[in-house]
Interface confidence: low
């Protein structure tokens, strides 16, 4: 017996109660592929979520987070509160980074400043709660008679943790 369901396009479902007729997905549901025996319920963007893309009969709704929150995870499956630069989110809310750590974003955790001496370099610019230290030439490069042709090492890109 041929499976007539394979003929049902996206946006419909194969209705076994009606001799495998392709029925349109009911309101607030969708099927993104053909041959489906049911339609999936549309995602609802409510509460801390806001709608980025409305649900259609062939594709699910897509959500964003309201102002003051940012998306977390694939397809914005969660929203998390923003903090300021120089802070991290804890169970008790946003807290300032401890001395020796920084966070240059509104999300994520405070990370340790780069240890310039591990690369044989010196601190050119001190770190803050919001910014990593900037490493400069090694102390030996700065001694009298040393060549000054070597430019200072660039600061690490934001958001990259120390190696």
């Amino acid at each position: 017996l041929q499976d007539l369901c394979s003929n049902c396009p996206a946006g419909t479902f194969c209705d076994n109660n009606r001799s495998q007729i392709c029925s349109p997905c009911p309101p607030n549901s969708f099927s993104s592929a053909g041959g489906q025996r049911t339609c999936d319920i549309c995602r609802q963007c409510k509460g801390v979520f806001k709608t980025r893309k409305e649900c259609s009969s062939t594709s699910n709704a897509e959500c964003d987070c309201i102002s003051g929150y940012h998306c977390l995870g694939a397809e914005c499956s969660m929203c998390e509160q923003d903090c300021k630069q120089g802070q991290e989110l804890t169970k008790k809310g946003c807290k300032d980074c401890c001395f020796g750590t920084f966070n240059d974003q509104k999300r994520g955790i405070c990370r340790p400043w780069t240890n310039c001496s591990l690369d044989g370099k010196s601190v050119l610019v001190n770190g803050t709660k919001e910014r990593d230290v900037v490493c400069g030439p090694s102390p030996a490069d700065l001694s009298p008679g040393a060549s000054s042709a070597t430019p200072p090492a660039p600061a690490r890109e934001p958001g990259h943790s120390p190696q």
Epitope: Y69, A74, S77, M78, C79, K91, I109
Partner: antibody, heavy 123, light 107 residues
């Protein structure tokens, strides 16, 4: 204090359906996601899915989507997981868990756990 | 799905020793990692969240670290009550996934 109460054990015949319960107390039931987690003997943990009791919004692990159905009864502050067509592979301990914080921000970590229901699938 | 690979699967140590358990994610999970402890026949208990923050009541001999895809749980000066199984879990994306677990036994 927060409590998630689960029956200790369930014996189910292969192919029959089993509905596991998780009775919550000590907090506002509708404000916190409830998760279900599977642990086979001597093995790791597997997340099945979760449900937000306020509006019954669910997320599922695709692996379980066809056979697990999560529901809640707000009047009794109870969450349920129905497992259809179980086989011996479904013999495991099933935990219900609750996320730590209410609403947002939410760490999506499982701070509270029920004692687990041991499901044995056997004829 | 993000796969979590935990190692070692088992280890034995003595009271007072320091041990480290590692967890590798198949993609960047940006510190959205939790560690759980599970005693024989009991439910797991949250130890660490956000990769490094200790849950309430967890002794300071436990510490979490890591970033990107590589994370670790360190237990300093092991106590008798620390023996059992440990699980890591990512909550960066659905489906939430766990490592295979590490069984810590008394030597």
């Amino acid at each position: 204090q927060v409590q998630l109460q689960q029956p200790g054990a369930e014996l189910v015949r292969p192919g029959a359906s089993v509905k596991l319960s998780c009775k919550a107390s000590g907090y506002t039931f509708t404000s916190y996601w409830i998760n279900w987690v599977k642990q086979r003997p001597g093995q790791g943990l597997e997340w099945i899915g979760n449900i937000f009791p306020s509006d019954s919004y669910t997320n599922y692990n695709q692996k379980f989507k066809d056979r697990a159905k999560l529901t809640v009864d707000k009047s009794s502050s109870t969450a349920y997981m129905q497992l259809s067509s179980p086989t011996s592979e479904d013999s495991a301990v099933y935990y219900c868990t609750r996320f730590g914080s209410s609403g947002y921000p939410d760490y999506y970590t499982m701070e509270y756990w029920g004692q687990g229901t041991s499901v044995t699938v056997s004829s | 799905d993000i796969q979590m690979t935990q190692s070692p699967a088992s280890l034995s140590a003595s009271v007072g020793e320091t041990v480290t358990i590692t967890c590798r994610a198949s993609g960047n999970i940006d510190n959205y990692l939790a560690w759980y402890q599970q005693k024989q026949g009991k439910s797991p208990q949250l130890l660490v969240y956000n990769a490094k923050t200790l849950a309430e009541g967890v002794p300071s001999r436990f510490s979490g670290s890591g970033s990107g895809t590589e994370y670790s749980l360190k237990i300093n000066s092991l106590q008798p009550e620390d023996f059992g199984s440990y699980h890591c879990q990512q909550y960066w994306t659905i489906p939430y996934t766990f490592g295979g677990g590490t069984k810590l036994e008394i030597k």
